[in-house]
């Protein structure tokens, strides 16, 4: 890597760089080359990015051989484009205001990352992108002719926004039940949710129910037969009980569970109903909760993070089970 | 970042009204409601009315009479009034923001004497 | 009159898995009553942990849930860590009105 050897180019062409990055001679004054850029490595044939004031820092003891693109003070930044000065402040969007700083840009968000929680006002909060705003705003998914102040979150029906199924209306009210969202947990159990006005008042509620995509401690990738990446809906081999907080299932289970891949896919509940299971406390207390039983699985690419209530409440629906009367078929 | 600052005066004679202000930054109170809460010395916490995102409002029963909650969009600011105050209003009063209550301000003393 | 009660304290051990409970004077809680968690930690602000019965607040770590247990809202703590140690409150709505619980305070020992 050092200047004593002849001069040998890679190549007789000059390379192609990405947008943003110079081409330079090496320091040995031999070859063209892309320029390395702030925080990746150099050396001596392989130098910093110049015009971006950028030189190779070889730390001390200054006689090794490898060092890290390095600003010097007061370097500029090329960001999206343009050339900005160490200080000068800019918005790279309506989203996210930015500052260069010695040759390294860093930016803030100018829209709130906020996040909000259920409450009478707002059973049911979703972010949406709104025409003409640039930051999404929080909507609350209530019935448009909901009492214009108070959180009485009557679904009565005063205009034909919906086009109901005339078998769902009940004493004016329009019966409206979410699908069941995913479950807060990817092993485990866990809690699925939704939301529903079919109740004597006709009043929004939140519904929730047990769910168990996969136990914790089943080690599913070692059942995946050979030359195949997924094993959908592994066969349990054995009833089993459930436990909740101490408590623990009257009766077993032979339940169904969903797999897993080994190419990136994640598989996820498809088809469920629900059904009530009772737990038996160690005071003695008997407590009943409706939990999800798992029809069939898929596995797909569409996975969000793992166990996050918000992303999964809005992201990764569950079909079947939309029953308004009666929980489970 | 998110803000609840309750404002008022210290001490309020009896059979006098308490008003408190509570300014908000970092999000809109037409989008959040916003609930007064109070706790008194060594005391558990009293839930005594929230003013709606839309501007409707909803009371602690045993204080309907003599409460007034109120807002101001434009400020961004939730007023807070109760009259007829006795010493058992002596309290440290909160504004905290509806949705789980997750934001709270960090309360102001309220002290009902002559 | 309605009262929300809570269990006046609880001590665990950390790492351990504590459940605190929230009864309603009027019968069983369900999702309607949009069960909230507020915390105090001594010498700091109230701060909401859990919101409509189940949602974790961005601030809450995964150890805590909520959830309804028996016709109570619960809130279950595993792997409790010292930090944990503050004074924990429950509030139901019902239909125009909250009533806070006379709060839980949570002892970690150690």
């Known amino acids: 890597q050092d200047c004593s050897a002849q001069c040998q180019c890679a190549a007789e062409a000059a390379p192609h760089c990405p947008a943003g990055v110079s081409l330079v001679l090496d320091g040995c004054g031999c070859c063209r080359v892309c320029a390395k850029q702030l925080g990746e490595l150099c050396t001596e044939r392989d130098p910093c990015d110049p015009h971006k004031g950028l030189f190779c820092d070889f730390g001390s003891p200054a006689n090794r051989k490898i060092g890290v693109c390095t600003a010097k003070d007061g370097a500029p930044c090329v960001f999206g484009g343009s050339v900005y000065r160490s200080g000068e402040s800019f918005q790279s969007s309506c989203k996210y205001q930015c500052t260069c700083l010695d040759g390294a840009v860093g930016c803030v968000p100018l829209c709130s990352m906020d996040v909000r929680l259920p409450s009478p006002d707002c059973p049911f909060p979703r972010r949406v992108k709104l025409p003409g705003k640039c930051c999404e705003e929080w909507v609350c998914d209530e019935p448009k002719d909901r009492t214009a102040v108070g959180p009485a979150l009557a679904a009565y029906r005063l205009e034909d926004t919906f086009g109901p199924d005339p078998t769902m209306m009940r004493a004016n009210c329009l019966v409206q039940t979410t699908e069941w969202s995913a479950c807060s947990k990817t092993c485990g159990m866990g809690i699925s949710t939704r939301v529903t006005n079919d109740n004597t008042f006709c009043r929004l509620e939140k519904q929730s129910r047990l769910c168990m995509v996969r136990p914790c401690e089943a080690d599913l990738e070692e059942n995946i037969k050979k030359g195949k990446k997924c094993i959908r809906t592994p066969k349990i081999a054995k009833p089993v009980k459930f436990e909740l907080s101490g408590c623990t299932s009257v009766k077993t289970y032979r339940a169904k569970f969903c797999g897993v891949c080994t190419d990136g896919r994640c598989c996820t509940p498809h088809r469920t109903t629900t059904l009530p299971v009772e737990f038996k406390c160690p005071d003695g207390e008997i407590m009943k909760k409706n939990m999800m039983f798992i029809k069939t699985c898929a596995c797909h690419y569409n996975c969000p993070g793992d166990n996050d209530i918000f992303e999964s409440l809005y992201y990764r629906k569950m079909y079947g089970d939309m029953a308004h009367h009666h929980h489970h078929h | 970042e998110v803000q609840l600052q309750e404002s008022g005066p210290g001490l309020v004679k009896p059979s006098q009204t308490l008003s408190l202000t509570c300014t908000v930054s970092?999000?809109?109170?037409?989008?959040?409601?916003v609930h007064w809460i109070r706790q008194h010395p060594g005391k558990g916490l009293e839930w005594l009315g929230v003013?709606?995102?839309?501007?409707?409002?909803d009371y602690n029963a045993a204080f309907m009479s003599r409460l007034t909650i109120s807002k101001d969009t434009s400020k961004n600011q939730v007023s807070f009034k109760l009259s007829s105050v006795t010493a058992a209003d002596t309290a440290v009063y909160y504004c905290?923001?509806?949705?789980?209550?997750?934001?709270w301000g960090q309360g102001t003393t309220v002290t009902v004497s002559s | 009159e309605t009262v929300v009660t809570q269990e006046p304290s609880l001590t665990v051990s950390p790492g351990g898995t504590v459940t605190l409970t929230c009864r309603s004077s009027i019968g069983a809680v369900t999702t309607s009553n949009y069960a909230n968690w507020v915390q105090q930690k001594p010498g700091q602000a109230f701060r909401g942990l859990i919101g409509g019965t189940s949602n974790r607040a961005p601030w809450t770590p995964a150890r805590f849930s909520g959830s309804l247990l028996g016709g109570k809202a619960a809130l279950t703590l595993s792997g409790v860590q010292p930090e944990d140690e503050a004074e924990y409150y429950c509030a139901l709505w019902y239909s125009t009105h909250y009533v806070f619980g006379g709060g839980t305070k949570l002892t970690v020992l150690g």
């Open positions: 970092g999000f809109s109170i037409s989008t959040f409601g």
């Open positions: 905290a923001r509806d949705g789980g209550f997750d934001y």
């Open positions: 003013i709606w995102r839309r501007g409707g409002t």
